[in-house]
């Protein structure tokens, strides 16, 4: 029978209304203080019984189903009894350092003893010895500046590298292109400890000691390495170690500064390129190889003794079916599996999403459903690859292909108390935008102002004056899987830091044995009014996905996206404009597709504003085709040696997974394109890749048509 | 004691190349740690670093003449040279050769000059 | 690129007149700036590394001081043979490496 609009409307307000009041910031610290007791490393006993922990609470907070989902994955442990670590060996081949074994435990955590030490997830075991060369932070531009600019070969040498700016997994792929026999990595000062505030306990900065742990791979969005493509369950054929996705050749090894410290002071070689090679010991930052003057004759050491293991994890899995539209999926997910404690990544974030299962679970015990199914996700193993959220979508994939209306995901809810920061869709824009507006700012100074304009504020969008700042997706967390291989509109929201003032990258503390409840509390947000937002920002996203009756996603948005990507990439070619005329690359059919695609959405949303949205088959059909829109800019061949990696208008950067490219396949063709031996080759690859763009934004355009 | 004399023409044409060479005595470049460049000095722009070498090759050009600039080292004849092409009226300058004050402190204070020679840039 | 200013541009002192040059770095350098004494003619000669360590051979009545952006260079009681352009030089960021504009001193 026809609905009330207006009666529909206010029940929507008034629902979400009562939504977002019952979210709690003391039920949040609550569940952040249960989350950080022991460790719950992936594969672990404390894990699983975490799992089933949430598996019977969700189950209480009044979802209809919860299960938990296992799989057996490859991962990645450090020897109990035979530890690693690197050493300066004199020329008799004794050792005259050592690098510290394990992190000093904070206060209060001396007696917990499955304490994983520092390592890095996957490196193979190997006893490499040799000269060190410092490489920066392991870019690809810092490899350059090394072999093209200053002639100094990588080949046969230790490599070591400060942590950030890049994924660590890059920077040991770029330690193995170069010829590297081992890696070590380490936290520079400049990098993880602002100035003017004191180290944990006192602060929130990394002491000397302290150490990031975290996964080498190269995965490209294969999920576990053995069973590419497929679910690691009981039937899965697995390949041989020699054959798995994505691990590194070389051993890895984490330390941290004062470790770095010995190391670096007697390096020997020229001097750094540049300042910004620099960091913050006390060390002159020679670029080597090996050490100088009297302390040539020393070498440096790995040993590495790690294993991999085939291992169950376990995803717990909720399900709220919809009232309406029980077969259209809005999907909210985060890990449970932290590196130590996981004061931040994950429990941060699990915490919140156990806040707004506790919230819609509520609703629903007053029956009041959502109108489409609200799926919650616990994920396992996200800190070995992303292996818990990826078998599990390998798993349903064709479910999530067909039904997969939005996903967003829920990690770490804090890296700073500063700002908003939201990297989503363009289909989300509009409404992260409009909730924004919706919400109390939690900010001083905002005190009866939105977040929006607290957001807007201290992150202006550098493209568009009065509006915040919204960023590419790239990957480096769950919802890879559900936006990269599966085109599922996908968004993700998190207070930050001020990036202006704070260079630090990622918090100081992040993936330390010192990333614990008190450091949220004493430091981070001591009256958890961040998570408090950050939870109404996410559980808003969700619910207006799940209940608003025309889906809340914005082709239009998607359109000037894709104007202002094309726009961009066509810059970068113009850098050779000889070649282009020579080999007769255009990019005229591009922005023809784009302008295409932009009249089309026009008129889209205006037969949107026409909809009679009481009649339910109109409302599905175009409900649909926003939905597919995502889905529209998959290519089921994928990307150029990343067949995981398919969305054509975003990709993880092929230089840092943690970042997002647009229009992936034409940036990596252009590349570096100057270098290339066979020019002709190489522009024929960029003219493959603008065809390929084209197609898909045009295809895309084509689904966005009146369908009859 | 370590001397540094530099040596190349005195007129340069625009257009053309300049070349200058840096002889070296008193010290071994490739066991030394030291590093060696390239300064100059304008009426206008008073003193300009152009330049430093290592003597493993590695190099460190201002990012104002990079484009132009190349430096080359000689260690069998304990030489270092500039080169810089596509000269102007602008590049008409003293130029001294230096030693970074070292060894092993890197890009630090130039401890050591050499007594310049001065280059004119005209048809 | 660290720009480097120097005050005032001419100083005229007296024999035995306290002579204070100043030099100021756009963006924080450390401590790692250099002062030169050049006279007509001549290449500049290394006085102050390290903004206060004196190079080898330089006479007690030099002195540097200052860190990050403000730096000072003093002649306790300067000589007439004291008579030079004086030039500051960063070395903390580069490239560039870059000099200030100089500081004339004059002692009558």
């Known amino acids: 029978k026809p609905s009330n609009e207006a009666t529909g409307n206010v029940s929507h307000s008034g629902m979400k209304k009562e939504f977002l009041h019952e979210l709690k910031a003391e039920n949040i610290k609550k569940f952040l203080y249960n989350f950080t007791r022991t460790p719950h490393l992936a594969g672990t006993q404390n894990n699983f019984e975490l799992a089933k922990q949430i598996h019977d609470q969700w189950k209480e907070f009044g979802l209809d189903l919860v299960e938990l989902s296992h799989y057996d994955v490859l991962l990645s442990y450090p020897n109990k009894t035979h530890p690693n670590y690197i050493s300066i060996i004199n020329e008799d081949g004794n050792e005259i350092f050592k690098t510290s074994l394990s992190e000093q435990p904070p206060p209060g955590y001396e007696n917990i003893s499955d304490v994983v030490p520092p390592y890095s997830a996957f490196s193979p075991q190997g006893t490499p010895e040799g000269d060190l060369v410092y490489v920066n932070y392991a870019r690809t531009e810092d490899f350059f500046k090394l072999e093209r600019e200053m002639k100094i070969s990588c080949s046969g040498k230790i490599v070591i590298a400060r942590y950030g700016k890049v994924f660590r997994g890059n920077m040991v792929k770029n330690a193995q292109l170069a010829g590297a026999k081992g890696m070590i990595l380490y936290s520079d000062p400049a990098d993880y400890f602002v100035p003017a505030v004191k180290s944990y306990p006192d602060g929130w900065n990394l002491p000397g000691g302290g150490v990031q742990r975290g996964n080498v791979l190269n995965l490209n969005g294969a999920g576990d390495p053995l069973t590419p493509g497929y679910p690691a369950n009981e039937h899965a054929y697995r390949h041989e170690l020699t054959n798995a996705v994505g691990l590194p050749s070389i051993p890895v090894h984490p330390i941290g500064y004062d470790d770095a410290q010995k190391l670096l002071e007697h390096m020997g070689g020229p001097a750094p390129p540049d300042s910004s090679w620099k960091g913050g010991l006390k060390v002159p930052y020679n670029v080597g190889p090996g050490f100088a003057g009297n302390f040539s004759t020393q070498k440096v050491k790995m040993h590495i003794h790690s294993y991999t293991k085939v291992t169950r994890i376990y995803n717990v899995i909720g399900t709220l079916k919809g009232a309406l539209e029980p077969d259209r999926y809005v999907i909210l997910g985060g890990h449970r599996d932290a590196w130590v404690f996981g004061g931040i990544d994950p429990q941060s974030g699990a915490a919140v999403v156990h806040e707004i299962v506790r919230s819609f679970g509520t609703l629903k015990k007053k029956g009041r459903r959502p109108r489409r199914t609200i799926l919650f996700a616990s994920w396992d193993a996200e800190e070995f690859g992303l292996l818990g959220s990826t078998e599990w979508a390998e798993e349903h994939s064709r479910l999530l292909q067909e039904r997969g209306v939005a996903y967003i995901n829920a990690d770490s809810s804090i890296e700073g108390n500063y700002t908003l920061r939201v990297d989503c869709t363009p289909l989300m824009y509009s409404l992260v935008y409009n909730l924004t507006k919706e919400l109390q700012s939690p900010d001083e100074g905002f005190e009866g102002k939105s977040l929006y304009d607290s957001w807007k504020e201290k992150s202006p969008s550098p493209e568009f004056i009065g509006m915040p700042r919204i960023s590419k997706l790239g990957s480096g967390n769950d919802f890879e899987v559900f936006f990269q291989r599966l085109g599922i509109a996908s968004g993700r929201a998190r207070y930050t830091k001020n990036w202006k003032t704070n260079k630090v990258s990622s918090y100081p503390l992040y993936h330390s044995v010192y990333e614990t409840y008190e450091l949220v509390v004493k430091f981070y947000d001591p009256t958890f009014k961040y998570h408090l937002t950050v939870a109404q920002v996410r559980g808003a996203m969700v619910f207006e996905l799940a209940n608003s009756i025309v889906l809340p996603f914005d082709c239009q948005s998607y359109a000037v996206a894709l104007k202002k990507y094309a726009d961009t990439i066509y810059n970068i070619s113009m850098k050779h404009p000889q070649e282009m005329k020579a080999y007769m690359i255009s990019f005229d059919s591009l922005f023809s597709a784009v302008n295409n695609f932009t009249d089309v959405a026009s008129k889209f949303n205006q037969r949107l504003q026409e909809l009679d949205k009481s009649n339910p088959i109109l409302l599905r059909i175009m409900n649909d085709q926003l939905m597919y829109l995502e889905r529209a800019f998959i290519d089921p061949l994928g990307l150029p040696g990343r067949p995981f990696y398919r969305h054509i208008i975003y990709a993880p950067s092929s230089h840092n997974k943690y970042a997002g490219e647009s229009f992936p396949g034409i940036y990596d063709a252009l590349f570096d394109i100057s270098s290339k031996v066979n020019a002709s080759k190489a522009w024929n690859e960029v003219k493959r890749q603008i065809s390929i763009a084209t197609f898909t934004v045009q295809a895309a355009a084509e689904t966005l048509r009146e369908v009859a | 004691q370590v001397q540094l004399q530099e040596s190349g023409p005195g007129l340069v044409k625009p257009s053309e190349t300049l070349s200058l060479t840096c002889t070296v005595s008193g010290a071994s470049f490739s066991s030394s740690g030291y590093y060696w460049g390239w300064i100059r000095q304008t009426p206008g722009k008073g003193l300009e670093w152009i330049g430093t070498m290592f003597y493993s090759g590695a190099t460190y050009y201002n990012p104002s003449l990079k484009s132009r600039l190349s430096l080359y080292m000689d260690t069998s004849k304990q030489e270092f040279s500039l080169r810089l092409a596509s000269v102007t009226a602008a590049d008409t300058a003293v130029y001294y050769c230096?030693?970074?004050?070292?060894?092993?402190?890197?890009?630090?204070?130039?401890?050591?000059w050499g007594q310049g020679t001065l280059v004119t840039v005209s048809s | 690129d660290v720009e480097m200013t120097q005050s005032p541009a001419t100083l005229s002192l007296s024999p035995g007149d306290r002579a204070t040059l100043s030099c100021r770095a756009s963006?924080?350098?450390?401590?790692?700036l250099a002062w030169y004494q050049q006279k007509p003619g001549q290449a500049p000669r290394l006085l102050i590394y390290g903004a206060s360590t004196r190079a080898p051979g330089i006479p007690a009545r030099f002195s540097g001081s200052g860190t990050g952006t403000e730096f000072t260079l003093t002649i306790s009681s300067p000589k007439s043979e004291d008579s030079a352009v004086y030039y500051c030089?960063?070395?903390?960021?580069?490239?560039?490496?870059?000099f200030g504009g100089g500081t004339k001193l004059e002692i009558k």
């Open positions: 230096v030693r970074h004050r070292g060894p092993d402190t890197g890009l630090d204070a130039f401890d050591l």
């Open positions: 963006q924080s350098v450390s401590s790692d």
């Open positions: 030089q960063q070395y903390n960021y580069w490239p560039p490496l870059t």
